[in-house]
């Protein structure tokens, strides 16, 4: 009897390993969203970027939702959030309206329950992009660890969106769940 | 009998906890590679950096391989990849030929099966390093979440490699596995 | 008998799932510390920032300790560390002592056992903040994967602390445990 139980135990525990690994390692939400270059807004002031790819190239999403330009959390947890935003200008694109630029990114969290928006992370630089150089480039990277609740939404705002680099390796943001909330 | 089973169960489940923790938390691949300053190439255009430390100072690697200047994935999964690249110039470093510099990093993925290279992340800035200042410095940080398959290789390309800061806290890249592929 | 054992097993294994998830996902240490703007030191040289929030706004901590301006590790492991540091100046703040600035961050690790301090990561830029522009801004982001032992301490040093942006979304640092040490 005892021997039979041990054998059964080993079998159950074996499948348990698979189950635990699957439950832990595969159900964890993540997203990596890359800029949709066909739909970049214009302007120089802070604007929300609403068009991102989640299903082509490096873009991907699992156990999170992308809707109306926002990354929606489906599972409570602590997440690592990140964004990489590249700006560029070539003299062949025409003259800049000003040589003094504020190139910024803001990663914001919106709660549906309490309709309010909060900036989680910001980064950027003021730049002097003079006419003496034919090409200008600048990238911002931000990242941080945040508690997110199901239903909360993450969005990206930038200044000078018309200067964004439209490559998928240049302008993107993402999130992955690291742990549950106690 | 029932009591005996419970006790045995507790014992097995106890070792199970160790096993699960070990299997999950210790087998996860990671790498943190720091620049090998004795072997930085010259050039102004994009060049691949092939010499990195994986076993001294902050450099370390586990369940991944470093070979021929590339970080090789041994385990399918979703990984967080990152790079920090610092550039610097002091008037005693040499005769800088231009004030207008493009300081860039490209994190690339190469697939052996389909011999092709793709840029996962890029970052950097054009800089004006004038002779009016005796010292110049600039750092780039990029990071993102990517699906990597066993056998794929990660490498780092930079512009102006001779301007790299050779300190281990300055110029490095790395990866750690976050979750399995479904 | 065998049926009874199976039922008991299922029950135990069910609670096991909770236990395993809890032990793995909830006990993992993390911290996200945001700058305490009421206590920023002055000076232009490298200074240690000792005043951070860990319990308000985005600030949070679990299974780590914050004491004497340092983030103390309570659990051996491999951690992802990050920092985001923003500097800014508006002409209404008064004239800058110099237009040539070195805006830097250093993430350091101190071991109590062997009283020594080592820089894990550094980043930043030299900047020319000319009087021609009324506002200047610059952000640094660094991140990397490091082995930390219980009792070790993480601290942040910056140059030009009086230029720090005091917003919680601007100047922060953090850590989260990714895996155990083999």
């Amino acid at each position: 009897g005892s021997q039979h139980i041990r054998a059964e135990k080993a079998m159950v525990d074996g499948s348990w390993l698979d189950l635990a690994k699957r439950s832990k390692l595969e159900a964890q939400p993540f997203a990596h969203l890359t800029i949709n270059a066909t739909d970049i807004p214009s302007g120089s002031h802070k604007v929300s970027l609403s068009s991102w790819y989640h299903d082509r190239g490096w873009g991907k999403i699992s156990n999170m939702t992308f809707s109306n330009g926002k990354l929606i959390v489906n599972q409570d947890g602590f997440y690592y959030l990140y964004a990489n935003i590249c700006f560029r200008h070539h003299e062949t694109s025409g003259d800049l309206a000003t040589e003094y630029l504020q190139l910024m990114v803001y990663v914001t969290k919106t709660s549906i329950k309490i309709p309010s928006s909060h900036t989680l992370m910001k980064g950027g630089s003021t730049k002097y992009w003079s006419g003496n150089s034919e090409f200008h480039f600048y990238s911002i990277n931000v990242g941080g660890f945040f508690k997110l609740r199901s239903g909360e939404e993450i969005s990206i705002e930038v200044s000078n969106p018309s200067l964004l680099d439209p490559d998928q390796d240049a302008t993107y943001f993402g999130a992955f769940k690291v742990r549950d909330i106690d | 009998g029932s009591q005996h089973i419970r006790a045995e169960k507790a014992m097995v489940d106890g070792s199970w906890l160790d096993l699960a923790k070990r299997s999950k938390l210790e087998a996860q691949p990671f790498a943190h590679l720091t620049i090998n300053a004795t072997d930085i190439p010259s050039g102004s255009h994009k060049v691949s950096l092939s010499s990195w430390y994986h076993d001294r100072g902050w450099g370390k690697i586990s369940n991944m391989t470093f070979s021929n200047g590339k970080l090789i994935v041994n385990q399918d999964g979703f990984y967080y990849l990152y790079a920090n690249i610092c550039f610097r110039h002091h008037e005693t470093s040499g005769d800088l030929a231009t004030e207008y510099l493009q300081l860039m990093v490209y994190v690339t993925k190469t697939s052996i099966k389909i011999p092709s290279s793709h840029t996962l992340m890029k970052g950097g800035s054009t800089k004006y390093w004038s002779g009016n200042s005796e010292f110049h410095f600039y750092s780039i940080n990029v990071g993102g979440f990517f699906k990597l398959r066993s056998g794929e290789e990660i490498s780092i390309e930079v512009s102006n490699p001779s301007l790299l800061d050779p300190d281990q806290d300055a110029t490095y890249f790395g990866a750690f596995k976050v979750r399995d592929i479904d | 008998g065998s049926q009874h054992i199976r039922a008991e097993k299922a029950m135990v294994d069910g609670s096991w799932l909770d236990l395993a998830k809890r032990s793995k996902l909830e006990a993992q240490p993390f911290a996200h510390l945001t700058i305490n703007a009421t206590d920023i030191p002055s000076g232009s040289h490298k200074v240690s920032l000792s005043s951070w929030y860990h319990d308000r706004g985005w600030g949070k901590i679990s299974n780590m300790t914050f004491s004497n301006g340092k983030l103390i590790v309570n659990q051996d492991g491999f951690y992802y560390l990050y920092a985001n540091i923003c500097f800014r100046h508006h002409e209404t703040s008064g004239d800058l002592a110099t237009e040539y600035l070195q805006l830097m961050v250093y993430v350091t690790k101190t071991s109590i056992k062997i009283p020594s301090s080592h820089t894990l990561m550094k980043g930043g830029s030299t900047k020319y903040w000319s009087g021609n522009s009324e506002f200047h801004f610059y952000s640094i982001n660094v991140g990397g994967f490091f082995k930390l032992r219980s009792g070790e301490e993480i601290s942040i040093e910056v140059s030009n602390p009086s230029l720090l942006d005091p917003d919680q979304d601007a100047t922060y640092f953090g850590a989260f445990k990714v895996r155990d040490i083999d």
Epitope: E134 | S42, S44, D95, L96, T98, G131 | -
Partner: antibody, heavy 122, light 107 residues
Framework: EVQLVESGGGLVKPGGSLRLSCAAS????????MSWVRQAPGKGLEWVAG????????YYPDTVKGRFTISRDNAKNSLYLQMNSLRAEDTAVYYC???????????????WGKGTTVTVSS | DIQMTQSPSSLSASVGDRVTITCKAS??????IAWYQQKPGKSPKLLIY???YRYTGVPSRFSGSGSGTDFTFTISSLQPEDLATYYC?????????FGGGTKVEIK
């Protein structure tokens, strides 16, 4: 056509001064570092001055440091060499040379002018 | 300063011959060596840079090799128009220094 044309050479007494000019055409002058290289009669080549593309960095060997000054005017596509306290050993053909693109710390020269002759003699 | 010693100072060879010139640096210059051709009464012309890279438009009979302190410049098949003096230059560290030159004559 990429071209460099030197002028301003001539005969000068020891201790005297001379200003050489180099007119550049056929390329985006402001993007290139430039140098002056000289060649004494029947001798080899000697680098005497270098200037960065934007003109804020200038470099000299010890043989001319403090006596020669290199400068440029990117708006006029022009390079200059002001030579003071001239000596007999400064007698040479002076070439204006464009530094090729390459590593930012390494200087070699892909376009040369025809040269202008400087003779220092009493 | 880095001294560049070129040898031979002159040589005479026939059309079609393989000609080799050597250049020795007084210290390690990695692969930072350029080679120039200067025809009589003309200005120098860049042939090779970074020890082995042929500059745009330079015929394939000209090649360079070496690293560290010892470098070689080769003309695989000498042509009448190759009559010139050849100079090496280190572009590793300032001041940029040239070899004394090698005068190549046609027999």
């Amino acid at each position: 056509e990429v071209q460099l044309v030197e002028s301003g050479g001539g005969l000068v007494k020891p201790g005297g001064s001379l200003r050489l000019s180099c007119a550049a055409s056929g390329f985006t002058f402001r993007n290139y570092a430039m140098s002056w290289v000289r060649q004494a009669p029947g001798k080899g080549l000697e680098w005497v001055a270098g200037i960065s593309s934007g003109g804020t960095y200038t470099y000299y060997p010890d043989t001319v440091k403090g006596r020669f000054t290199i400068s440029r005017d990117n708006a006029k596509n022009s390079l200059y060499l002001q030579m003071n306290s001239l000596r007999a050993e400064d007698t040479a053909v002076y070439y204006c040379a464009r530094r090729d693109y390459g590593d930012v710390y390494e200087w070699y020269f892909d376009v040369w002018g025809k040269g202008t002759t400087v003779t220092v003699s009493s | 300063d880095i001294q560049m010693t070129q040898s031979p100072s002159s040589l005479s060879a026939s059309v079609g011959d393989r000609v080799t010139i050597t250049c020795k640096a007084s210290q390690d210059v990695r692969t930072s060596i350029a080679w120039y051709q200067q025809k009589p009464g003309k200005s120098p012309k860049l042939l090779i840079y970074s020890a082995s890279y042929r500059y745009t438009g330079v015929p394939s009979r000209f090649s360079g090799s070496g690293s560290g302190t010892d470098f070689t410049f080769t003309i695989s098949s000498l042509q009448p128009e190759d009559l010139a003096t050849y100079y090496c230059q280190q572009h590793y560290s300032s001041p940029w220094t040239f070899g004394g030159g090698t005068k190549v004559e046609i027999k």
